[in-house]
């Protein structure tokens, strides 16, 4: 009961974590900077990975794609490759995972089958959520270490001067909610390796032996019947004892005079 | 990078009309805000009048009712119509712009060079 509930919790706080994902992906607010110096009207500027958008004070909101590969920072480029395999990983151990829940019956799917895709699963989403927080971490240090800031004051061609706007880009929603999926994702991934431990079945080897009547010259030896568990010095499926006790296969080759009463 | 050119500046009488037109050009991303600045000799730059690109504009308070700001998206390009000229208004008129050359770079202040009106008998 409790690999079961250990096994959905896993696979829910993955699949929330990895909407998360696909969210702070697709958003647009991973960086943001406030314009003061505006006689006009207040000026909302804000990046995504997939576009860059500017509000002003009265609503009005334009946003424009990156359409070009070839000028885009190489980092920038990191982020967006890392955010997408995540998504990829974390899709398809979602995909893994639902046919690997104890609660779903697909045909005759044995239990250590069913352990083995948890496992396989768990490891997608731990790697899924480290490669989210891996993005949204090298895109906060783009910005902590001001990267953006590559024009200040310096003169054109034209004769026209160009001067950055003092102002700095501050973390946007889309890094928090990052990080925050990007740990669901990596915590759910634990909880589904954790399950696998406990949905792998245990190699106990309950032999079927057949005991038979015996002739009086074999004596009956105390404590001889032993389960094997695989870990015992009786693997190899040895006569535990002299006379009448053997295993299924044994009385099938070897008929004996002892056999037959 | 933006550049931003100025033109339509001269001599004109008082009471007379001008208009001013900045044209920006280069790798244009997005221009949010155009703005008219002047700067009258030994004096300060001051903010005249400008525009955004919501259709939001503002005006100083000495050329408000005189002077008409105006904004052309799809050029990339800002007008000031001034009415009413008066030897006050005598200065170098700068284009400003709020821009960014590419998205995910800061937005920045370009400049144009400037452009000399003269109101004068």
């Known amino acids: 009961m409790a690999v079961t509930a250990c096994q959905g919790l896993g696979f829910v706080v993955s699949l929330i974590g990895i909407a998360g994902i696909i969210a702070a992906t697709c958003m647009d607010q991973w960086s943001t900077q406030d314009l003061y110096n505006n006689p006009v009207t207040a000026v909302f500027n804000y990046q995504g990975l997939w576009r860059s958008c500017v509000r002003e004070s009265s609503g009005f909101t334009e946003c424009r794609g990156y359409f070009t590969l070839l000028g885009l920072p190489a980092m920038l480029q990191a982020v967006r490759a890392l955010m997408i395999v995540g998504i990829v990983l974390g899709a398809i151990g979602l995909l893994v995972s639902i046919f690997a829940l104890k609660c779903i019956r697909i045909g005759s799917m044995e239990d250590s089958a069913k352990a083995n895709m948890t496992l396989t699963s768990g490891i997608m989403f731990i790697v899924s959520g480290l490669c989210a927080i891996a993005g949204v971490s090298v895109f906060a240090n783009m910005l902590v270490t001001n990267f953006w800031m590559s024009t200040a004051n310096m003169y054109t061609g034209m004769g026209g001067m160009v001067q950055t706007v003092q102002t700095r880009y501050t973390f946007g929603a889309a890094l928090f909610v990052g990080w925050v999926a990007g740990g669901l994702t990596l915590i759910g991934g634990v909880m589904m390796c954790i399950a696998c431990r406990g949905l792998a079945p245990e190699e106990t080897n309950y032999k079927a032996v057949s005991y038979h009547a015996s002739g009086h010259s074999v004596a009956y030896k105390p404590g001889g019947f032993k389960a094997s568990t695989g870990f015992g010095s009786n693997t190899k499926n040895k006569k535990i004892y002299d006379g009448g006790a053997r295993t299924e296969d044994e009385v099938q080759s070897y008929p004996s005079k002892h056999d037959y009463v | 990078q933006v550049q931003l050119v100025e033109s339509g500046g001269g001599l004109v009488q008082p009471g007379g009309s001008l208009r001013l037109s900045c044209a920006a050009s280069g790798s244009i991303f997005s221009i949010p805000v155009m703005t008219w600045y002047r700067q009258a000799l030994g004096k300060e730059r001051e903010f005249v009048a400008g525009?955004?690109?919501?259709?939001?504009?503002n005006y100083a308070d000495s050329v408000k009712g005189r002077f008409t700001v105006s904004r052309d998206n799809a050029k990339n390009t800002v007008y000031l119509q001034m009415n009413s000229l008066k030897s006050e208004d005598t200065a170098v008129y700068y284009c400003?712009?709020?821009?960014?050359?590419?998205?995910?770079?800061?937005?920045?202040?370009?400049w144009g060079q400037g452009t000399q009106v003269t109101v004068s008998s």
């Open positions: 400003n712009a709020q821009a960014s050359s590419f998205g995910w770079m800061p937005l920045s202040d370009y």
């Open positions: 525009i955004s690109k919501g259709g939001t504009s």
